[in-house]
């Protein structure tokens, strides 16, 4: 489900613009957090800080928690480490497209997309290609806008993420997220 009919233009949580703004805030915060945990100075990630409201802060915490869990999945880390970043755009869009290729959308896959973007950003930092950072963030938001926006609107905006991961079994969902990303990377490697 991409964009269904005309997108609402108001300022509510399901307006196109609000979803994109919140998505950009969450992505930026998530990537900055992942980079900070590596311990390295990353002035390239010192993007304009935007004040977060209480709802966005909760969402950011939720994403951090899932990110930490995914970091401890060794199979996933091995797969990501093996990604050839000579053509990062092709890798990103192939993996992203594959994650949603069956037409089934859920918050787990949205988080997997953010996580994969963060790993590509960290690779860019390690390989001293800082100009790629904003580019990768841009690709992620482009993909979100063109493929996921309508679905996020149908979930009532980003707050749907909290209810999805707010269950006692959120670790189980995180295992599913890792599986989605691992499967997509496997397919990409076979195609490559």
């Amino acid at each position: 489900m991409d964009g269904s009919g005309e997108q609402p233009r108001g300022g509510g949580p399901t307006s196109s613009e609000q979803i994109m703004k919140t998505g950009a805030l969450l992505l930026q915060g998530f990537i900055q957090d992942r980079a900070g945990r590596m311990g390295g100075e990353a002035p390239e990630l010192a993007l304009d800080p935007v004040p977060q409201d209480a709802s966005t802060k909760k969402l950011s915490e939720c994403l951090k928690r899932i990110g930490d869990e995914l970091d401890s999945n060794m199979e996933l880390q091995r797969m990501i480490a093996a990604v050839d970043t000579d053509s990062p755009r092709e890798v990103f869009f192939r993996v992203a497209a594959d994650m949603f290729s069956d037409g089934n959308f859920n918050w787990g896959r949205v988080v997997a997309l953010f996580y994969f973007a963060s790993k590509l950003v960290l690779k860019a930092l390690c390989t001293k290609v800082p100009e790629l950072i904003r580019t990768i963030m841009g690709w992620t938001l482009d993909f979100l806008r063109e493929r996921l926006l309508g679905w996020i609107q149908d979930q009532g905006g980003w707050d749907g993420l909290l209810s999805y991961f707010g269950t006692p079994t959120w670790q189980t969902v995180t295992i599913f997220v890792a599986g989605v990303l691992t499967a997509s990377l496997t397919i990409w490697k076979k195609m490559g």
């Epitope: 196109s16 938001l141 063109e146």
Partner: antibody, heavy 119, light 109 residues
Framework: EVQLVESGGGLVQPGGSLRLSCAAS????????MHWVRQAPGKGLEWVAS????????SYADSVKGRFTISADTSKNTAYLQMNSLRAEDTAVYYC???FGYGWAFDYWGQGTLVTVSS | DIQMTQSPSSLSASVGDRVTITCRAS??????VAWYQQKPGKAPKLLIY???SLYSGVPSRFSGSRSGTDFTLTISSLQPEDFATYYC???????????FGQGTKVEIK
């Protein structure tokens, strides 16, 4: 109401330059992607260039790479196409279009501006 | 780059006919395929996005489908206002390397 209005077309000699503008209204271009598509007289549509103003990420068709530059000024809500080293084969109607939420389909288009490259 | 081969390049049909236009991708693509209608001297208009989703305000006689690398636009019952040129467009080869099909002119028989 969403609107895209192109301007800047005209007659230019081979090797010359021209700058096209696309003024957007009814939406904010910041989180959109903006595109230029051209159509030579009696021919089909050809994608020229795209920009995502949020990240300033740009992409170009091979036929214009190194000669054309797409840019955006979010404060003016306007996208631009700077065309240098123009050739006769660049003669076309140039359309500005946006994509926003429809799988990279272009949901709104401008009326087009004619660029004629001739001596 | 991915090429989109559109067929036929032109066709003649009568009002009420069922019309089918096909675009074949040169390699496997995702469903990021759109269809447009263009009339002389006018900008194209979006009909179908994501291979099979009908854009807002487009009559339901237009539909899109996908089978592997083949994408099809179908007009179930051709109306007088449907005589125009139709284009497919893909952006699946690593956005935004976008390509259009060559176009199909639908003329009155």
């Amino acid at each position: 109401e969403v609107q895209l209005v192109e301007s800047g077309g005209g007659l230019v000699q081979p090797g010359g330059s021209l700058r096209l503008s696309c003024a957007a209204s009814g939406f904010n271009i910041y989180y959109s992607s903006m595109h230029w598509v051209r159509q030579a007289p009696g021919k089909g549509l050809e994608w020229v260039a795209s920009i995502s103003p949020y990240s300033s990420y740009t992409s170009y068709a091979d036929s214009v790479k190194g000669r054309f530059t797409i840019s955006a000024d979010t404060s003016k809500n306007t996208a631009y196409l700077q065309m240098n080293s123009l050739r006769a084969e660049d003669t076309a109607v140039y359309y500005c279009a946006r994509s926003f939420g429809y799988g990279w389909a272009f949901d709104y288009w401008g009326q087009g501006t004619l660029v004629t490259v001739s001596s | 780059d991915i090429q989109m081969t559109q067929s036929p390049s032109s066709l003649s049909a009568s009002v009420g006919d069922r019309v089918t236009i096909t675009c074949r991708a040169s390699q496997s693509v995702s469903s990021a395929v759109a269809w447009y209608q263009q009339k002389p001297g006018k900008a194209p208009k979006l009909l179908i996005y994501s291979a099979s989703s009908l854009y807002s305000g487009v009559p339901s006689r237009f539909s899109g489908s996908r089978s592997g690398t083949d994408f099809t636009l179908t007009i179930s019952s051709l109306q007088p206002e449907d005589f125009a040129t139709y284009y497919c467009q893909q952006s699946a080869g690593g956005y935004p390397l976008i390509t259009f099909g060559q176009g199909t002119k639908v003329e009155i028989k």
